[in-house]
């Protein structure tokens, strides 16, 4: 007799989730010598322990503490790039500018990037059928709590000038309900972070508007200023040229505004 299973509104756990996490961990520790000491089996056990046998709407940051401890990593605090709704370009940027880091360039962010997972209360099974949706079901689900936890820690670790890449094509360039707007902005430490510099990425080829004057950017400026952190904003009119100039800064066309 098939056992009754809770039907959630979101997609189920990514197929081959345990194998994917383990494989990513092995790959990451091979590429990053400073993380070679990490025991990937222990990392998987801690990851699994955070959500297996627990109600997927009742996950806490505390559940992830063993994983956080195992994944402890020192990132140069003045080389942090945050992003909101523009992940691909942010990742392309740090692939070229190798001394800068997004959350997904850290071990824990790399392990979970683009994956979904959840378990079921009182059973050791992983739920591959469905997982809670943040809006329709509950916010304290395994995936949301994970990203909230690692994002908070990543923001708390930042210092000096912190950069954030924002999508200028969206109606809300700065969205206070995004992970950046709801978690990271509020966990930057004013005693450590000197300036938040926003890079607003333009989508349209002929878009010459100053998106730094957008009302949502003004809202971000206000939030940051109230926290006694300085604010700066730059328009990136040509993201393609921007990346090209990061690759080849000596190029003569890279002195003009991008």
């Amino acid at each position: 007799v098939p056992r009754w299973r809770q039907q959630w509104s979101g997609p189920g756990t990514t197929k081959r989730f345990p194998e994917t996490v383990l494989a990513r961990c092995v790959k990451y520790t091979e590429i990053h010598p400073e993380m070679r000491h990490v025991d990937c089996q222990s990392v998987w056990d801690a990851f699994k322990g955070a959500f297996i046998s627990k109600h997927p709407c009742n996950i806490t940051e505390e559940d992830y503490q063993p994983l956080m401890k195992l994944g402890t990593q020192t990132v140069p605090c003045n080389k942090i790039l945050l992003w909101s709704r523009i992940k691909d370009l942010a990742h392309q940027f740090t692939q070229v500018q190798r001394d800068m880091f997004t959350l997904e360039d850290t071990l824990l962010g790399y392990l979970a990037d683009d994956l979904t997972w959840c378990g079921e209360f009182n059973t050791s099974k992983i739920n591959y059928q469905s997982c809670p949706d943040w809006r329709k079901d509950c916010s304290n689900n395994p995936v949301s709590v994970f990203w909230k936890t690692v994002s908070r820690r990543f923001a708390e670790a930042a210092c000096d000038v912190v950069h954030v890449m924002l999508n200028g094509s969206r109606s809300k360039i700065f969205d206070k309900n995004s992970t950046f707007g709801s978690v990271e902005v509020h966990n930057l430490q004013p005693e450590k972070v000197q300036t938040l510099e926003a890079w607003v990425i333009h989508g349209g080829r002929e878009d010459s508007r100053d998106l730094c004057q957008d009302p949502t950017i003004k809202e971000l400026e206000s939030i940051i200023s109230k926290r006694n952190i300085q604010f700066s904003c730059k328009n990136i009119y040509r993201p393609d040229k921007f990346l090209q100039c990061v690759k080849n800064p000596e190029d003569s066309s890279c002195t003009s505004e991008i």
């Epitope: 402890t72 990593q73 605090c77 210092c159 005693e191 000197q194 300036t195 006694n228």
Partner: antibody, heavy 116, light 111 residues
Framework: QIQLVQSGPELKKPGETVKISCKAS????????MNWVKQAPGKGLKWMGW????????TVADDFKGRFAFSLDTSASTAYLQINNLKNEDTATYFC?????????WGQGTLVTVSA | DIVLTQSPVFLAVSLGQRATISCRAS??????????MHWYQQKPGQPPKLLIY???NLESGIPARFSGSGSRTDFTLTINPVEADDVATYYC?????????FGGGTRLEIK
């Protein structure tokens, strides 16, 4: 190149007021806060506080609250330190230094002498 | 406030030898593995010059004879080999927690 240039030495009497300037060049002034550091003759360094050059919000260390004030003229990329009701123990060299919390850029220092 | 205790207060070293200056903080100055401890050199009549930031990062333009190490509460500035131009007072400074504080200084002289 980045430079912080401070105003010249001052000789003041007790009870008077002095205002020291620190003019920044070579970078966007409003991107980095400005700190003030005191060094009494033959003594060590003491952080007085800093001013947020974007908002103008000053943070004054407890030991300097009351007679010491930080201000800005953003259009001139200049930060100011004002000391009111000068006392003999205010005799010192005052440095401006650019944030972040480690100071790679310093002004040359302004010697303030308080003497009757 | 975080108190920084430097030792020794005076240090005399022969040219070409190693100089080691210690700085102990009254509480940890670490944040997620980054140590907010910095080192400066000051010569008479001049402003301090940043040598090392965040415990072990060599400031641009500073010779590699200068190095910094340590974490949490115990930090060391090493000069190896010492040159005549290194005669100065050296200060540690923390920016982990306001108010930022400096150590009392260490005067380096040549034996």
């Amino acid at each position: 190149q980045i430079q912080l240039v401070q105003s010249g030495p001052e000789l003041k009497k007790p009870g008077e007021t002095v205002k020291i300037s620190c003019k920044a060049s070579g970078y966007t002034f409003t991107n980095y806060g400005m700190n003030w550091v005191k060094q009494a003759p033959g003594k060590g360094l003491k952080w007085m506080g800093w001013i947020n050059t974007y908002t103008g919000e000053p943070t004054v260390a407890d030991d300097f609250k009351g007679r010491f004030a930080f201000s800005l003229d953003t259009s001139a990329s200049t930060a100011y330190l004002q000391i009111n009701n000068l006392k003999n123990e205010d005799t010192a060299t005052y440095f401006c230094a650019r944030n972040p919390g480690w100071f790679a850029y310093w002004g040359q220092g302004t010697l303030v002498t308080v003497s009757a | 406030d975080i108190v920084l205790t430097q030792s020794p207060v005076f240090l005399a070293v022969s040219l070409g030898q190693r100089a080691t200056i210690s700085c102990r903080a009254s509480e940890s100055v670490d944040n997620y593995g980054n140590s907010f401890m910095h080192w400066y050199q000051q010569k008479p009549g001049q402003p301090p010059k940043l040598l090392i930031y965040r415990a072990s990062n060599l400031e641009s333009g500073i010779p590699a004879r200068f190095s910094g190490s340590g974490s949490r509460t115990d930090f060391t500035l090493t000069i190896n080999p010492v040159e005549a131009d290194d005669v100065a007072t050296y200060y540690c400074q923390q920016s982990h927690e306001a108010p930022w504080t400096f150590g009392g200084g260490t005067r380096l002289e040549i034996k």
